[in-house]
Amino acid sequence: MPGGCSRGPAAGDGRLRLARLALVLLGWVSSSSPTSSASSFSSSAPFLASAVSAQPPLPDQCPALCECSEAARTVKCVNRNLTEVPTDLPAYVRNLFLTGNQLAVLPAGAFARRPPLAELAALNLSGSRLDEVRAGAFEHLPSLRQLDLSHNPLADLSPFAFSGSNASVSAPSPLVELILNHIVPPEDERQNRSFEGMVVAALLAGRALQGLRRLELASNHFLYLPRDVLAQLPSLRHLDLSNNSLVSLTYVSFRNLTHLESLHLEDNALKVLHNGTLAELQGLPHIRVFLDNNPWVCDCHMADMVTWLKETEVVQGKDRLTCAYPEKMRNRVLLELNSADLDCDPILPPSLQTSYVFLGIVLALIGAIFLLVLYLNRKGIKKWMHNIRDACRDHMEGYHYRYEINADPRLTNLSSNSDV
């Protein structure tokens, strides 16, 4: 039925065909909303409502609490407090919005249908209170290219959520865009494992996401990026790691990401980018890097990055980058720094420095007193040393004697501790 999605079947008589044409023109039909065009149409034409309800259901009907447009190949089940994925999704659906619901768990084959949803290309599940996505949740969706799971507290994301199987190399996923912004669960709901590790395991399982071009992982409190994650996503064009807590990129390699066009690292806790990272970024042919709102530490370790910033064209808004630390450098524009500005003073605050100086003086005094005591008692110490030496000599002579007897094969029957 091109153009509209109705909850009723095709009708034989002319009046129903007319009504159906009206539905096509209206484009959007809601199965539930009393204010929607479909409902008002029904209320003004009671004959249509009674005739439709008498017919068997259409294979491409619109699920309860959803809005459908066959013309746009779109189904929207938005803010409906759904607790599970509707079973009666129309086969034509290309864009499915299931946002703002209460799905909680996405089981294996959550979208598996007979016939399959072969056209489904974009699936948005953001803000649907999902806390568990099980292995194979997105299986039997051969055309799924965009998946958005943002704003769900994913305490349990199966390693095989996207790959669908636990094989070491599984069938390639059709996914091209994976949006996982703000999926970190509250602290008390996290499993006893690294959240970063859980997400990365799902991204790497079975090497299924080799074709992924966009990956968004913003706002997830990531403290680090596991070193192998990017190497196994070679097709990436856009990577968003903004608004995390990344302190360093030292162990992250961008070398393999030759297609990478944008790298968002704004709003992290980056202090400096080291030579290795700078060289890798500079080596990416199409890259644009975003580094705003990081607490850059402008000391001697920053020199290479400042030199690079002055020369590179890859950093967007590089003129806006400013120092956070040390205090004397706060708010300084990075691009205006020179090597003379970038020293490594002792990072101890003056109060601590004073304490350590005082401690040093006290220890020196104690050492001096100890040496003085030793000097004043040198005769007694000398005598004591002689006594020790004599005692040791007597003891060692006895030891050597016993050792020689024990080593004699003719005396093996004698007890080693017997008096000889």
Epitope: N243, D267, N293, P295, G317, D319, R320, T322, A324, R330, N331, R332, V333, L335, E336
Partner: antibody, heavy 117, light 108 residues
């Protein structure tokens, strides 16, 4: 010590333009961003825009884009703001401030602009 | 844009009283970029607390700041006469940069 010295009060007619200045001393002018902030009598503070004197990069509040023009002269360590098509709503004290992401550490004394026919 | 809402708008406090001023953001602000300014009539604003909790140079230790996300506060442990002023919170996180409408702190 760091100082931001702003130009004298201005009395202008509606529809006219005005250009005020902010002379920086006590630090290297190009090392820090200069922001401009508006405060109407008895009101709060409103950010107009900012200029990075070293690179001459400028960022505006959309609300003032097209009417405010920020410039900087490195040789005299002076930042300027020109406001055009003035109305009575533009009557306010305009501050320049030196700082950035981590707060505006130093402020000028303000330039009072009165728009009246 | 991020709207900063300060409360109360006006507050009276006695000498020695503990005072807390709040600033609520319409969306999350990184605590590194949330600042407080003090302004007295006829004067320019002065940076008072930067990056949520760091006292600017010359600010008495009775002042403190805290908060994260969308909720921030400035606290005076023991009110003194010289603390009477208007206090503005300010975010330098998202453009356009914005200020709260201010809290006027008066001596009771």
């Amino acid at each position: 010590q760091v100082q931001l010295q702003q130009s004298r009060p201005e009395l202008v007619k509606p529809g006219a333009s005005v250009k005020m200045s902010c002379k920086a001393s006590g630090y290297t002018f190009t090392d820090y961003v200069i922001s401009w902030v508006k405060q109407r009598t008895g009101q709060g503070l409103e950010w107009i825009g900012e200029i990075y004197p070293g690179s001459n990069s400028i960022y505006y509040n959309e609300k003032f884009k097209g009417r405010a023009t920020l410039t900087a002269d490195k040789s005299s360590s002076t930042a300027y703001m020109q406001l055009s098509s003035l109305t009575s709503e533009d009557s306010a004290v305009y501050f320049c401030a030196m700082g950035g992401n981590y707060g505006f550490d130093y402020w000028g004394q303000g330039t009072t602009l009165t728009v009246s026919s | 844009q991020i709207v900063l809402t300060q409360s109360p708008a006006i507050m009276s406090a006695s000498l020695g009283e503990r005072v807390t001023l709040t600033c609520t953001a319409s969306s999350s602000v990184n605590s590194n970029y949330l600042h407080w300014y003090q302004q007295k009539p006829g004067s320019s604003p002065k940076l008072w607390i930067y990056s949520t909790s760091n006292l600017a140079s010359g600010v008495p230790a009775r002042f403190s700041g805290s908060g994260s996300g969308t909720s921030y506060s400035l606290t005076i442990s023991s009110m003194e006469a010289e603390d009477a002023a208007t206090y503005y919170c300010h975010q330098y996180h998202r453009s356009p940069l914005t200020f709260g409408a201010g809290t006027k702190l008066e001596l009771k």
